[in-house]
């Protein structure tokens, strides 16, 4: 039935990158407020963003408790004021979200090239191991800590003087590639989880080129 003059939320959408996870919905509230609940399939419902006038709710704290669980959220609509003065006290309207499994669905954030070092005709390229909001023993885990060998990086590299790209892959955060002596190269990396069916790849990192600050050149 629902309480008088409230409308159900709609377009419930999960927005998640590197496990930072926000549920968004519509409409902007007019004479109503929202409360969000989240649960695993087997768990109890927990209320978050209580009586909020926002149309988003940060659920990161809940999903990072177990990123491999599947979560469901629902958004309740309550009249803006006490129910007695606004009409019926029936069951509040609510709308369910799609199911969300963080480990399988969180977007991979844009990676960053931390450094590159040339030694002769070899270049070692290191990708920054980004910290997530997932905790273990009171410390925040990195993306590599969470995904382990499920996470690979693809390196795209090319001579500054040409457009032909080469690729390399690693299941660590480092690449060791062969380069032509005396040539400057540019690099970009992409995070990939090959086993996924959705959100498999991140956007490409910003391009870094040799001869700039991040690199180090050693003649052997």
């Amino acid at each position: 039935s629902g309480t008088t003059n409230t409308v159900a939320a709609y377009n419930l959408t999960w927005k998640s990158t590197n496990f930072k996870t926000i549920l968004e919905w519509e409409p902007k509230p007019v004479n109503q407020v929202y409360t969000v609940q989240i649960s695993t399939k087997s768990g109890d419902w927990k209320s978050k963003c209580f009586y909020t006038t926002d149309t988003e709710c940060d659920l990161t704290d809940e999903i990072v408790k177990d990123v491999k669980q599947t979560y469901l959220a629902r958004v309740f609509s309550y009249p803006a004021g006490n129910v007695e003065s606004t009409g019926s006290a029936g069951e509040p309207l609510y709308e369910n979200s799609p199911e969300f499994t963080p480990y399988l669905e969180t977007n991979l954030g844009q990676p960053t090239i931390q450094s590159f070092e040339q030694v002769g005709t070899k270049v070692n390229v290191t990708v920054e191991d980004e910290r997530t909001l997932v905790r273990r023993n009171n410390t925040f885990l990195s993306l590599r800590d969470v995904f382990g060998k499920d996470l690979i990086y693809t390196l795209y590299y090319w001579k500054s003087s040409s457009s032909g790209k080469k690729t390399a892959k690693t299941n660590t955060n480092e690449f060791l590639i062969d380069v032509d002596k005396g040539e400057n190269y540019c690099f970009s990396v992409q995070a990939v989880i090959p086993s996924r069916t959705v959100n498999r790849k991140s956007t490409d990192s910003p391009v870094e080129c040799m001869g700039q600050e991040k690199g180090e050149f050693r003649e052997i």
Epitope: P29, Q37, Y78, N82, V83, E84, A89, P92
Partner: antibody, heavy 119, light 113 residues
Framework: QVQLVESGGGVVQPGRSLRLSCAAS????????MHWVRQAPGKGLEWVAV????????YYADSVEGRFTISRDNSKNTLYLQMNSLRAEDTAVYYC????????????WGQGTLVTVSS | DIVMTQSPDSLAVSLGERATINCKSS????????????LAWYQQKPGQPPKLLIY???TRESGVPDRFSGSGSGTDFTLTISSLQAEDVAVYYC?????????FGGGTKVEIK
């Protein structure tokens, strides 16, 4: 007239449990959100927990999350606070209060019940 | 969490004089779409529960004498007792109901000078 009457307070040892009740009368209980607010001796007011009119949604202060549970029985016009794993710092007068003109604005309060956690 | 800070901690005012209590919130409690400040004031006398005086920062609860008034917006609020009476001796608390957890100021004790 609106009345809120708390009961269930007393002296309890650390780590033990206690259940507070708040009997409501004089208004449509099932139409109002209800809260617990506490006040340590000689100190200020601290919000503890809230439950929506329908009993579906509950929310807690970080200081009691996971230890306290708010609930209500609309058929009995009664609000409850189950307090587990009690600590010395939970010693306070516990008030139940009802939502007034808006959520979180308390137009009526009970007289309070004193909970003393001491060994 | 929104932190509410009241000043002064205590205040001694002569009967019939004006008493002014300030309350500051760590973030705005103004909701722009309805232009309302989600702030309330309570009075608590010794041995009694608190009593609602003001909500929406400036709306008096029914039955509250008109010597009590509230003002302010955003993060800075004031409760004014225009002419202090003996029965106004109490502790006064501000409270935000903009977002959970709900939070109160530390209280201001008003006494007669």
């Amino acid at each position: 007239q609106v009345q809120l009457v708390e009961s269930g307070g007393g002296v309890v040892q650390p780590g033990r449990s206690l259940r507070l009740s708040c009997a409501a009368s004089g208004f449509t209980f099932h139409s109002r959100g209800m809260h617990w607010v506490r006040q340590a001796p000689g100190k200020g007011l601290e919000w503890v927990a809230v439950i929506t009119y329908d009993g579906i949604n509950k929310y807690y202060a970080d200081s009691v999350e996971g230890r306290f549970t708010i609930s209500r029985d609309n058929s009995k016009n009664t609000l409850y606070l189950q307090m587990n794993s009690l600590r010395a710092e939970d010693t306070a007068v516990y008030y139940c209060a009802r939502d007034g003109v808006y959520y979180g604005v308390y137009d009526y309060w009970g007289q309070g019940t004193l909970v003393t956690v001491s060994s | 969490d929104i932190v509410m800070t009241q000043s002064p901690d205590s205040l001694a005012v002569s009967l019939g004089e004006r008493a002014t209590i300030n309350c500051k919130s760590s973030q705005s409690v103004l909701f722009s779409s309805n232009n309302k400040n989600y702030l309330a004031w309570y009075q608590q006398k010794p041995g009694q529960p608190p009593k609602l005086l003001i909500y929406w920062a400036s709306t008096r609860e029914s039955g509250v004498p008109d010597r009590f008034s509230g003002s302010g917006s955003g993060t800075d609020f004031t409760l004014t007792i225009s002419s202090l009476q003996a029965e106004d001796v109490a502790v006064y608390y501000c409270q935000q109901f903009h977002s959970y957890p709900l939070t109160f100021g530390g209280g201001t004790k008003v006494e007669i000078k």
